[in-house]
Interface confidence: low
């Protein structure tokens, strides 16, 4: 229904601190560099606006839309230009064209500091003396770093921080309790942020049909016994929320998922029976809990596939006529009976399934034709278990760091033109599937596999395509988004690159690594291997294993040395000399 | 599978008009961005403009600003470039260029568009 005032209607739904924290998330967002305490002026003048109309809808400018009001906000930011370049020339436009220049500027990567957390007894002192302050903080500086965060999780998130701090300051060993619990959210939060970008590159690249698509074969295989009309209601619901948050129409998004949360909980008869738990809660945990809930009990009496969509004499007129619908139900009932399988994998079997019929009906015998279709699946199935077996075998016999390292000289190989940093980041999270994943249960490894490692290569791509330097990676990344992750696995070392010179300051280190906390010594170690395999591409796996021990050996010695300063200028080079030696 | 189709080029004086079409087909060309392209003998291809799909979004490169104007017919799935204040250094080939069912134009490399018409020839000279 049509409301007289958006910003009155949206304060209304979402009471005042959950629109706060929706606006503020949405101005770090849209203008990443400005500080908390601007970013704070803004909310708190828009929630006051909010306040006037919420009192009288008929109030001067109480009728403008959201991206207007917004966007003024913006616009009015004091050396705009200076802070943000050409970015301000979205000022000079009209609404919806400066809401999308908004969009289009926003950075994947924006050269900001790693959020670095203080030292607990500082944390408890700063969020007991203001704790929504302290929360504002957590919202901005996360937000501004991943311009693409699912808002109404970010919230859910900040609430997890705020538990937990409260939780662990009233202890007396703050540290040891803060620690294990924050990296936990923050783990998760970092997973959120890469599967969210996923989701808005599919919506941006290929439009809402692909997003839809990608809701039907997840909420399918989540809520097998819901009809196809059910699933279609959840996903076109689903598309419209995450199309809002991509969108940065976040008070829109956060109201509308509340809403598909409060549907789902109201008809779990038809959705699934696994919903109670998380429908007892309250509104951020409960949306946030069926976002992941467990897969229904598929049911028993499902017919084979080929009923409908191989044997049916009416599958060139159901695919002519309905072409749309009919894929869309090949999808359902794929996925439902396949909870096994990644969505990435679904997709590929439907993309496979339409260029079949699209061939096949064109032909004098149509049925002959498409009547193998679901045997031609078998290789496209084979291809991802046995990614998902050679790797979990890896990650087993290597660890995570070990496999991190497998990978990064894998693909540094494939596209060694790719900065150093932005392939040892790509790495470690690749690597990280290990441990997310290959513990679990055998039927669950192969979605948990593919759909993160799709999520991280999607950041590959987006980082590639601000300055595109890899062929390979051009290539892998302009095809569809189900088709990168088997394209990246199939890359082999790329003959066309020149190797890198050796240079000895690449390979050279001091004694402040010794001081270094694990994580950032590994990113150290991890550089040093890429640069190897960048002046060595066709180095072998023994020989790169050669140098990283003798590496590891020597930041050991020279770390436990007494003058490490004298071990460190005097070993490295000896090192260096090493190194050389054993690629030569 | 898309399929690009451009006509309407030719001969024309420096300060002269021509407007090309680029007939698109396709499944939902109309929800793609289409691009235009261009290529002078012994150049790069450069983006010239570009117009969203299903978004009423428009892009040029700065050398044509204010010159030309993009626009589409989704009822005829067809795309034009009106080109006016045409200058020698427009002489290229012109391509229309696709990235099936991305609504933006989010990049300009030319590379990343797997989809190209066979180019049509503008020549601008006196």
């Known amino acids: 229904e049509a409301h007289k005032s958006e910003i009155a209607h949206r304060y209304n739904d979402l009471g005042e601190q959950h629109f706060k924290g929706l606006v503020l998330i949405a101005f770090s967002q849209y203008l990443q560099k400005c500080s908390y305490d601007e970013h704070a002026k803004l909310v708190q003048e828009v929630t006051d606006f909010a306040k006037t109309c919420v009192a009288d809808e008929s109030a001067a400018n109480c009728d403008k839309s959201l991206h207007t009001l917004f966007g003024d906000k913006l616009c009015a930011i004091p050396n705009l230009r200076e802070n943000y370049g050409e970015l301000a020339d979205c000022c000079t436009k009209q609404e919806p064209e400066r809401n999308e220049c908004f969009l289009q500027h926003k950075d994947d990567n924006p050269s900001l500091p790693p959020f670095e957390r203080p030292e607990a007894e500082a944390m408890c002192t700063s969020f007991k003396e203001n704790p929504t302050t302290f929360m504002g903080h957590y919202l901005h500086e996360v937000a501004r770093r991943h311009p693409y965060f699912y808002a109404p999780e970010l919230l859910y998130y900040a609430e997890q921080y705020n538990e937990i701090l409260t939780q662990c300051c009233a202890e007396a060993d703050k540290e040891s309790c803060l620690t294990p619990k924050l990296d936990g959210v923050k783990e998760k939060a970092l997973v959120s942020s890469v599967r969210q970008r996923m989701k808005c590159s599919s919506m941006q690249k290929f439009g809402e049909r692909a997003f839809k698509a990608w809701a039907v074969a997840r909420l399918s295989q989540t809520f097998p016994n819901a009809d196809f009309a059910e699933i279609t209601k959840l996903a076109t619901d689903l598309t419209k929320v995450n199309k809002e948050c991509c969108h940065g129409d976040l008070l829109e998004c956060a109201d509308d998922r509340a809403e598909l949360a409060k549907y789902m909980c109201e008809n779990q008869a038809t959705i699934s029976s696994k919903l109670q738990t998380c429908c007892d809660k309250p509104l951020l945990k409960k949306a946030h809990c069926l976002s992941e809930v467990e897969h229904d009990t598929m049911p028993a009496d499902l017919p084979a596939i080929a009923a409908d969509f191989v044997e049916d004499q009416e599958v060139c007129k159901n695919y002519a006529e309905a072409k749309d619908v009919f894929l869309g139900t090949f999808l359902y009932e794929y996925s439902r009976r396949h909870p096994d399988y990644s969505v990435s994998l679904l997709l590929r079997l439907a993309k496979k399934y339409e260029a079949t019929l699209e061939k096949c009906c064109a032909e004098a015998n149509p049925p002959a034709c498409y009547g193998t279709v679901l045997a031609e699946f078998q290789p496209l199935v084979e291809e991802p278990k046995n990614l998902v077996k050679t790797n979990c075998d890896l990650y087993e016999k290597l660890g995570e760091y070990g496999f991190q390292n497998a990978i990064l000289v894998r693909y540094t190989q494939k596209a060694p033109q790719v900065s150093t940093p932005t392939l040892v980041e790509a790495a470690r999270n690749l690597g990280r599937v290990g441990t997310k994943c290959c513990t679990l249960p055998e039927d669950q490894r192969l979605p948990c596999v593919e759909d993160y490692l799709s999520a991280i290569l999607n950041r590959v791509c987006l980082l590639h395509e601000k300055t595109p330097v890899s062929e390979h990676v051009t290539k892998c990344c302009s095809g569809s988004l189900v088709e990168r992750r088997p394209c990246f696995s199939a890359l082999t070392v790329d003959e066309t690159y020149v190797p890198k010179e050796f240079k000895a300051e690449t390979f050279t280190f001091h004694s402040d690594i010794c001081t270094l906390p694990e994580k950032e010594k590994q990113i150290k170690k991890q550089t040093a291997l890429a640069e190897l395999v960048k002046h060595k591409p066709k180095a072998t796996a023994e020989q790169l294993k050669t140098v990283m021990d003798d590496f590891a050996q020597f930041l050991d010695t020279c770390c436990k040395a007494a003058d490490k300063d004298t071990c460190f200028s005097t070993e490295g080079p000896n090192l260096v000399t090493r190194c050389k030696d054993a690629l030569a | 599978e898309v399929q690009l189709l451009e006509s309407g080029g030719g001969l024309v004086q420096p300060g002269g008009s021509l407007r090309l079409s680029c007939a698109a087909s396709?499944?939902?060309?109309?929800?793609?961005?289409v691009a235009w392209f261009r290529q002078a003998p012994g150049k790069e291809r450069e983006f010239v403009a570009g117009?969203?799909?299903?978004?009423?979004?428009?892009y040029y490169a700065d050398s044509v600003k204010g010159r030309f104007t993009i626009s589409r017919d989704n009822s005829k799935n067809t795309l034009y470039l009106q080109m006016n204040s045409l200058r020698p250094e427009d002489t290229a080939v012109y391509y229309c260029a696709a990235r099936p069912g991305q609504p933006l134009i989010t990049s300009k490399v030319a590379d990343l568009y797997p989809y190209w018409g066979q180019g049509t020839l503008v020549t601008v000279s006196s």
């Open positions: 396709g499944r939902y060309i109309d929800e793609t961005a």
């Open positions: 117009i969203g799909g299903g978004v009423d979004i428009t």
